[in-house]
Interface confidence: low
């Protein structure tokens, strides 16, 4: 099938990094500078993505693959493929419509992006809180209260009524 197709369509012989040039009797021409073709048999090459402004180049464009961008320091990628950049927040914060806000009590965020998430509820696993949570860190669960020596106490934080960070922002 491939051989038959090749006889019928000379363009199918053009490899990635080239295009089938109609202006030159359908011979395979290399992609011009700042363009690429990631598959064979292409009739045109695609323009390379340019990482400008708040974007910076993570991977240079080649004749067979597009450039990849990430964000300058203080910003992080949003959306699949880093189609845009948004400001970082500090650990212990989340980005809201009004900018960076501290995580509510009972929640944490250990990254510069993303949402505040509830502390683990140790009691759900029959365990006790070994180390209390903070805005930046989850609680550390320890052995179950029954395993503790007599007189030892544990603190289990109240579970938030609803998972935060899910308001539409």
């Amino acid at each position: 099938f491939e051989r038959t197709r090749s006889l019928q369509d000379p363009c199918s012989n053009c490899p990635a990094g080239t295009f089938c040039d109609n202006n030159r009797n359908q011979i395979c021409s290399p992609c011009p500078p700042n363009s690429f073709s990631s598959a064979g048999g292409q009739r045109t090459c695609d323009i390379c993505r340019q990482c400008k402004g708040v974007f910076r180049t993570r991977k240079e464009c080649s004749s067979t693959s597009n450039a990849e961008c990430d964000c300058t320091p203080g910003f992080h990628c949003l959306g699949a493929g880093c189609s845009m950049c948004e400001q970082d927040c500090k650990q212990g914060q989340e980005l809201t419509k009004k900018g960076c806000k501290d995580c509510c009590f009972g929640t944490f965020n250990d990254q510069k992006r993303g949402i505040c998430r509830p502390w683990t509820n140790c009691s759900l696993d029959g365990k006790s809180v070994l180390v209390n949570g903070t805005k930046e860190r989850d609680v550390v669960c320890g052995p179950s209260p029954a395993d503790l020596s007599p007189g030892a106490s544990s603190v289990t934080p109240p579970a938030p009524a609803r998972e935060p960070g899910h308001s539409p922002q």
């Epitope: 949003l78 959306g79 189609s83 989340e94 993303g114 998972e163 539409p168």
Partner: antibody, heavy 119, light 107 residues
């Protein structure tokens, strides 16, 4: 390369259910929201809801509440949208699209899944 | 639900023309508005978010403006590839709602 690949076209009878899948590649679905948007023939776009694949939490448009269920399988980077009690008005192309933890950034879309409801 | 009223529903224009599409929200949505372009048989494509922030790769002829309840998408000099249907989307509150669409046709 970022991709959302949806399951194939479906033809269903009124009252039946349909489950459409959306398999992601090239990014971590737990870093994003996945939204579902539908488009009836010759009509505009209609947001159905979204799922946070990290937690499994979903928000649905009131119009679909009780009929739609969005689930995910993080091990296969696949999100599902099930719509039950189908009626002819549900005939549409259903799209999955990536959002983001903070904004409705639907910047990559699946190819769409055609669902036809006909007796 | 927040209603998004888009106008005009269709517009005929020529290559090189300046075109303006408006979107009016039934209540203030701050800057939580994005614009999409859709061509027949294809999935929509995000052009602009937060009213005026262009997605990387969107040509400079596209621009967005507005705040509160009134928003505008402007194409400064129409190119052949711009003929498509355009939708606005509010994402201040659930359910997110799209405008009815503006079909941009060749005159």
């Amino acid at each position: 390369q970022v991709q959302l690949v949806q399951s194939g076209a479906e033809v269903k009878k009124p009252g039946a259910s349909v489950k459409v899948s959306c398999k992601a590649s090239g990014f971590n679905i737990q870093d994003t929201y996945i939204h579902w948007v539908r488009q009836a023939p010759g009509q505009g776009l209609e947001w159905m809801g979204r799922i946070d694949p990290a937690s499994g939490n979903s928000e649905y448009a009131q119009k679909f509440q009780g009929r739609v269920t969005m689930t995910r399988d993080t091990s296969t980077s696949t999100v599902y949208m099930e719509l039950s009690s189908l009626r002819s008005e549900d005939t549409a192309v259903y799209y999955c699209t990536t959002g983001n933890l903070h904004y409705a950034l639907m910047d990559y879309w699946g190819q769409g899944t055609s669902v036809t409801v006909s007796s | 639900d927040i209603q998004m009223t888009q106008s005009p529903s269709s517009v005929s224009a020529s290559v090189g023309d300046r075109v303006t599409i408006t979107c009016k929200a039934s209540q203030p949505i701050n800057t939580y508005l994005s614009w999409y372009q859709q061509k027949p048989g294809k999935a929509p494509k995000l052009l602009i978010y937060r009213v005026n922030r262009k997605v990387d790769g969107v040509p400079s002829r596209f621009s967005g403006s507005g705040s509160g309840t009134d928003f505008t998408l402007t194409i400064s000099s129409l190119q052949p590839e711009d003929f498509a249907t355009y939708y606005c989307l509010q994402y201040l509150d659930f359910p997110y709602t799209f405008g009815g669409g503006t079909k941009l046709e060749i005159k």
